[in-house]
């Protein structure tokens, strides 16, 4: 479809409300430090221009590409050099290099304050100007999550609006809002991590890797859909995510709406679980489709061995049509295994490929590849046993101590990584236990390894910004499917020189007493990571004792009248006894 004016086309397709929201998100993801008011001004100017083009597509500049129009607009920001430094150099470039330049300057860890719910002030702002209030939410989330899936953020903004609509008239706004906003924050973090993994996959492994991931996942979700149907959805969905990852949020949202329409029109041949989704309005419909539960397996699925281990024509197909042949294997295997993680399915497909590569060069290929399915058994057993071991530990000690075990584990693997990053990753991995270990056996593995992939990608993204460990770089860049096994295989870094002991690292003050529980935990967990960096060979028992002593010390001093005096007096004693315990 060629349109005289791309901006008019998208404005007409999306409507003013969604158009404005997506432009605001896109701009906030590029210029993460700009004040909200500056972004609103830019968005209003772009929207007025889009309206002009919608009225007359041949008006001046309406034929320009969206990258040109948006890039030109971003480059008008007066404080660009002062606020962003070398990002301003992007403005010297021509498209498409300019947009690529903007993308490379997106900051996954911007130095922005934590957003604290303030029900009274927020309700007043919401009631005074709902559109501005929701715009501010889009802006605040987008600038903290520069790869957030644009159209999905519009959906979450509707949830946010619904929460305030319900809670602001309530007698106890705080009691009504806090649990809702906490739950929304968790969904936002999960959604952000999912899209970041897709964008990282494009950046580091290419479109083929994203397509393979999607073939596996969609075949699990839609086991009755035929290969052509899955191929069509994968192709369209890959385009959608490629656009969003490249900052082309208008095209992305438009194509996503088209895909949702297609899926709903053909739901009979895709999945029986789509009915409830397809009755909803656009944003809810797309979200619902993305999160839809796996359909029941068709009862008549034949065993795979006949076609993929016994057929004489396998090598002909492998040699002459490698990609599509392996694609059909991945589709057929995945649709039969909703109980496997995506990365496990990709590892199985990789093993199948390696076997054919070897066997098809031999004198008697069929005899060689006949036992290929036996080679999948150890691939499946390894993560299953890992999940069992970790869920057993989680059930024994609970979330907080499970997080601590993971912080210790990952600090030993990569002690060079910053403490805040190790604590964040350890805490996220620990929460996977709470999410997945309560599930039925058949759902534990996919839940655990799929969520682990998100947490490890976060580690890779943060490490890419400031690389400190060759072993982490290797795990992050070698293979998407092998990431988790690669990290699992990392042992204590023997080349690491233990960090010098600094008493101030372990010095606590009375301010810890007034912190919310999760921030208190983070303080203690930071100390734990620092202890491991100081004594990487400390035993579990030693660390448990020292951390227990720290917790008791904090509880004791926080219960005292003169808290600060207690911290000042007892702190050095604790530090000394801890050093002794770890000697």
């Amino acid at each position: 479809d060629t349109h005289k004016s791309e901006i008019a086309h998208r404005f007409n397709d999306l409507g003013e409300k969604h158009f404005k929201g997506l432009v605001l998100v896109a701009f906030s993801q590029y210029l993460q430090q700009c004040p909200f008011e500056d972004h609103v001004k830019l968005v209003n100017e772009v929207t007025e221009f889009a309206k002009k083009c919608a009225a007359d597509e041949s008006a001046e500049n309406c034929d320009k590409s969206l990258h040109t129009l948006f890039g030109d607009k971003l480059c008008t920001v007066a404080t660009l050099r002062a606020t962003y430094g070398e990002l301003a150099d992007c403005c010297e470039k021509q498209e498409p290099e300019r947009n690529e330049c903007f993308l490379t300057h997106k900051d996954d860890h911007p130095n922005l304050p934590k957003l604290k719910p303030e029900p009274d002030a927020q309700c007043a702002a919401f009631q005074e100007d709902p559109d501005k209030f929701l715009g501010k939410y889009l802006y605040e989330v987008a600038r903290r999550h520069p790869y957030f899936y644009g159209p999905e953020l519009l959906f979450h903004a509707e949830e946010y609006k619904a929460d305030f609509t319900e809670c602001c008239p309530a007698d106890d706004k705080l009691a009504c809002l806090i649990p809702k906003l906490d739950a929304l924050k968790e969904r936002i973090l999960l959604s952000s991590a999912k899209e970041r993994l897709k964008c990282s996959s494009f950046q580091n492994f290419g479109e083929r890797a994203v397509k393979a991931w999607s073939v596996a996942r969609l075949s699990q979700k839609f086991p009755k859909a035929d290969f052509a149907e899955v191929s069509k959805i994968v192709t369209d969905l890959t385009k959608v995510h490629k656009e969003c990852c490249h900052g082309d949020l208008l095209e992305c949202a438009d194509d996503r709406a088209d895909l949702a329409k297609y899926i709903c029109e053909h739901q009979d041949s895709i999945s029986g679980k789509l009915k409830a989704c397809c009755d909803k309005p656009l944003l809810q419909k797309s979200h619902c489709i993305a999160e839809v539960k796996e359909d029941d397996l068709p009862s008549d699925l034949p065993a795979l061995a006949a076609d993929f281990a016994e057929d004489k024509e396998i090598c002909k197909h492998y040699k002459d049509a490698k990609d599509v042949f392996l694609g059909t294997f991945l589709y057929e295997y995945s649709r039969r295994h909703p109980d496997y993680s995506v990365s496990l399915l990709l590892r199985i497909a990789k093993t199948y490929e390696a076997t054919l590569e070897k066997c098809c060069a031999e004198a008697d290929p069929p005899a060689c590849y006949r036992t290929v399915f036996d080679q999948f058994t150890p691939l499946v057993e390894e993560p299953k046993s890992l999940v069992k071991k970790n869920c057993d530990l989680f059930e024994e000690v609970g979330e907080y101590d499970f997080q601590n075990a993971l912080i210790v584990r990952y600090t030993k693997k990569a002690p060079q990584v910053s403490t805040p990053t190790l604590v964040e990753i350890g805490r996220t991995l620990g929460k996977v236990g709470s999410r997945c270990c309560k599930l039925p056996e058949s759902e534990r593995l996919p839940c655990s390894e799929n969520h682990l992939a998100l947490a490890l990608n976060r580690l890779c993204v943060l490490h890419e910004k400031t690389p400190v460990s060759e072993k982490i770089t290797k795990c992050c860049t070698d293979s998407l499917a092998e990431r988790r096994p690669c990290f699992s295989a990392l042992e204590l870094d023997e080349g690491y020189v233990p960090k010098e002991f600094k008493a101030e690292t372990f010095t606590f003050h009375a301010d810890i007493c007034t912190l919310p529980e999760d921030e208190k935990q983070i303080k203690k967990q930071s100390a734990l990571a620092e202890l491991v960096k100081h004594k990487p060979k400390a035993t579990k028992e030693q660390l448990k004792t020292v951390l227990g002593n720290f917790s008791a010390f904090v509880a004791k001093c926080c219960g005292r009248e003169d808290k600060e005096a207690c911290f000042a007096e007892e702190g050095p004693k604790l530090v000394a006894s801890s050093q002794l315990a770890l000697a």
Epitope: A228, A321, V324
Partner: nanobody
């Protein structure tokens, strides 16, 4: 549902060329694998060639490799079989076929068939 309409075929001399066409209609055709089969008198229907929708992957029967070329035009929703260096043993009714799966290729949809006769 996919409908397949064949054209081409006829009587030619050994060594000549012929092109068969098969126009498809119906949804998601672009994601189907298209192929050609043939059935000689008194024999079973046999596989000739197939092509994946993106045009990048093709498989041929050993008996036609190097002489026949399968191609696809997604804009026209049409698949072609270019047959060169024809031999009398290529004489058969040729069927266009379509299936959602590239492998195993067990066609769900068939064209009406078209006669190709190669005289010596």
């Amino acid at each position: 549902q996919v409908q397949l309409q064949q054209s081409g075929g006829g009587l030619v001399q050994a060594g000549d060329s012929l092109r068969l066409s098969c126009a498809a209609s119906g949804r998601a055709f672009n994601y189907y694998t298209m192929g050609w089969f043939r059935q000689a008198p008194g024999k079973e229907r046999e596989f000739v060639a197939k092509i994946y929708w993106d045009g990048g992957s093709t498989i041929y029967a050993d008996s036609v490799k190097g002489r026949f070329t399968i191609s696809i035009d997604n804009a026209k929703n049409t698949v072609y079989l270019q047959m060169n260096s024809l031999k009398p043993e290529d004489t058969a009714v040729y069927y266009c076929a379509a299936d959602p799966s590239f492998y195993p290729f067990r066609p769900k949809y068939w064209g009406q068939g078209t006669q190709v006769t190669v005289s010596s």
